[in-house]
């Protein structure tokens, strides 16, 4: 339920981070793709009533009503059609907010990889952030936490997971002997490599940080076409949203 071996980031230095809440409690992470769109993990919404869900943007300390925070309801949830709950295959979804975020220093967008981008290679340095609990016993962190990790060779990872992974998953490891990575309430949050969202926190093993079961993410590059297709179909807008740039060949 928490970032392992990480540190608290400078407040609002990760303006794309979204907190998905149910019943007033932080449940999962996500990232802001467009002013009205958040990307998260599909498993975060299993057996959940969207009417009770909220998305908080511009947050650092979740327990504080910070002036930078913007809170939205969820208008619509689009889960990948091939999402499989037990294997976590295609563990990705898009949330359409019930309003448009006002972009600024504390609320900003994170770009996914380009349409033809390849996943980061083994050894690539990345970072993963989240508000998951920072102790065994459900204490919230003082603020947004982040850990530095490295991409793990997919064959090595698949072997660790006894062949259960799919080609659209991505794994990370600690860069050294210290345990670093994510835990359950960090689900849906982005793995950022070279300033792009290359992964979404998906699952780990019987406990977090076990080197025998490396952290597994949804490989965002495999779903870029689907992401933009959903956004295009659901939001027929004539031009880019204020403060955004549209990657070549990608609909707003």
């Amino acid at each position: 339920a928490q970032i392992i071996g990480g540190h608290e980031v400078t407040p609002h230095s990760r303006p794309y981070m979204a907190s998905v809440r149910f019943g007033g409690q932080h449940h999962c992470g996500g990232f802001l793709l467009r002013a009205r769109w958040v990307v998260s993990a599909a498993h975060c919404f299993s057996h959940r009533d969207l009417r009770t869900g909220l998305v908080v943007l511009g947050a650092h300390v979740l327990s504080t009503a910070e002036p930078t925070q913007q809170v939205f309801g969820i208008d619509a949830l689009t889960t990948h059609p091939d999402y499989h709950p037990m294997t976590h295959a295609n563990d990705i979804c898009l949330l359409r907010l019930n309003g448009s975020a006002v972009l600024g220093p504390a609320v900003g967008l994170l770009r996914p990889p380009g349409r033809r981008a390849r996943p980061p290679t083994a050894g690539t340095r990345c970072r993963v952030a989240g508000w998951g609990f920072v102790s065994d016993f459900e204490e919230l962190p003082p603020g947004l936490m982040e850990a530095k990790v490295r991409v793990l060779d997919p064959d090595v990872c698949n072997s660790s997971w006894k062949g259960h992974l799919t080609l659209t998953m991505l794994c990370t490891r600690s860069g050294d002997s210290h345990r670093r990575g994510f835990c359950s309430a960090d689900s849906g949050g982005p793995l950022v490599c070279r300033n792009r969202a290359h992964g979404l926190v998906s699952f780990s093993g019987l406990w977090c940080g076990d080197p025998k079961t490396p952290d597994v993410y949804t490989q965002v590059s495999a779903f870029v076409a689907w992401i933009w297709d959903v956004v295009r179909r659901s939001s027929p807008q004539p031009g880019p949203l204020p403060g955004t740039t549209r990657p070549p060949g990608e609909a707003a």
């Epitope: 339920a1 498993h43 976590h88 609990f133 102790s135 835990c183 359950s184 093993g205 019987l206 025998k212």
Partner: antibody, heavy 119, light 107 residues
Framework: EVQLVESGGGLVQPGGSLRLSCAAS????????IHWVRQAPGKGLEWVAG????????DYADSVKGRFTISADTSKNTAYLQMNSLRAEDTAVYYC????????????WGQGTLVTVSS | DIQMTQSPSSLSASVGDRVTITCRAS??????VAWYQQKPGKAPKLLIY???FLYSGVPSRFSGSGSGTDFTLTISSLQPEDFATYYC?????????FGQGTKVEIK
């Protein structure tokens, strides 16, 4: 209040089967993994199996691999241990425990259920 | 699998004594060690996690220390309710493994 209640223990003949249940209340499965730990009479604690209900990932002690199956029904907040091909050395009190994901500690345990394998 | 070796296997002590139990891991487990107390006919209870953190509700006379391969549980002043069996457990990697236990008896 967090509670774990085991049931399903009893006397069974060698080669027989039993299914243990662990009913959880006071918390939701999603933040934890559920484990079975056993204790043979007068002996120490031995981890048997564990499951992460969020993704169904399971693991087993070598001593029970291929004979025991752990499962969970998240809608019922219940975990199960299906024990087949039971042997005399499986005789023990079986505890289910909640393991907190962060550092792998078992913070709540059930009261235990006795499984006796004897002819 | 990682082996956890506890010593002593049993000890006799009096109320008020300082008691130390050690646990050695067969390989580096960082600080991923917990200590449990078990009384006859009862389930184990968590005392210490992450080698040195006192679990909620556990008296402050219990403390833990160590990292790497060597770990210690200390009871600063033994109380009548502390006579029990104590187990260490590593949670560095699966499978989780326990020490064989240390029985603390009344002298």
């Amino acid at each position: 209040e967090v509670q774990l209640v085991e049931s399903g223990g009893g006397l069974v003949q060698p080669g027989g089967s039993l299914r243990l249940s662990c009913a959880a209340s006071g918390f939701t499965f999603s933040g934890y993994s559920i484990h079975w730990v056993r204790q043979a009479p007068g002996k120490g604690l031995e981890w048997v199996a564990g499951i992460s209900p969020t993704n169904g990932y399971t693991d087993y002690a070598d001593s029970v691999k291929g004979r025991f199956t752990i499962s969970a029904d998240t809608s019922k907040n219940t975990a199960y241990l299906q024990m087949n091909s039971l042997r005399a050395e499986d005789t023990a009190v079986y505890y289910c425990a909640r393991l907190v994901f962060y550092r792998g500690v078992m913070d709540y345990w059930g009261q235990g259920t006795l499984v006796t394998v004897s002819s | 699998d990682i082996q956890m070796t506890q010593s002593p296997s049993s000890l006799s002590a009096s109320v008020g004594d300082r008691v130390t139990i050690t646990c050695r891991a067969s390989q580096d487990v960082s600080t991923a060690v917990a200590w449990y107390q078990q009384k006859p006919g009862k389930a184990p209870k968590l005392l210490i996690y992450s080698a040195s953190f006192l679990y909620s509700g556990v008296p402050s006379r219990f403390s833990g220390s160590g990292s790497g391969t060597d770990f210690t549980l200390t009871i600063s002043s033994l109380q009548p309710e502390d006579f029990a069996t104590y187990y260490c457990q590593q949670s560095y990697t699966t499978p989780p493994t326990f020490g064989q236990g240390t029985k603390v008896e009344i002298k």
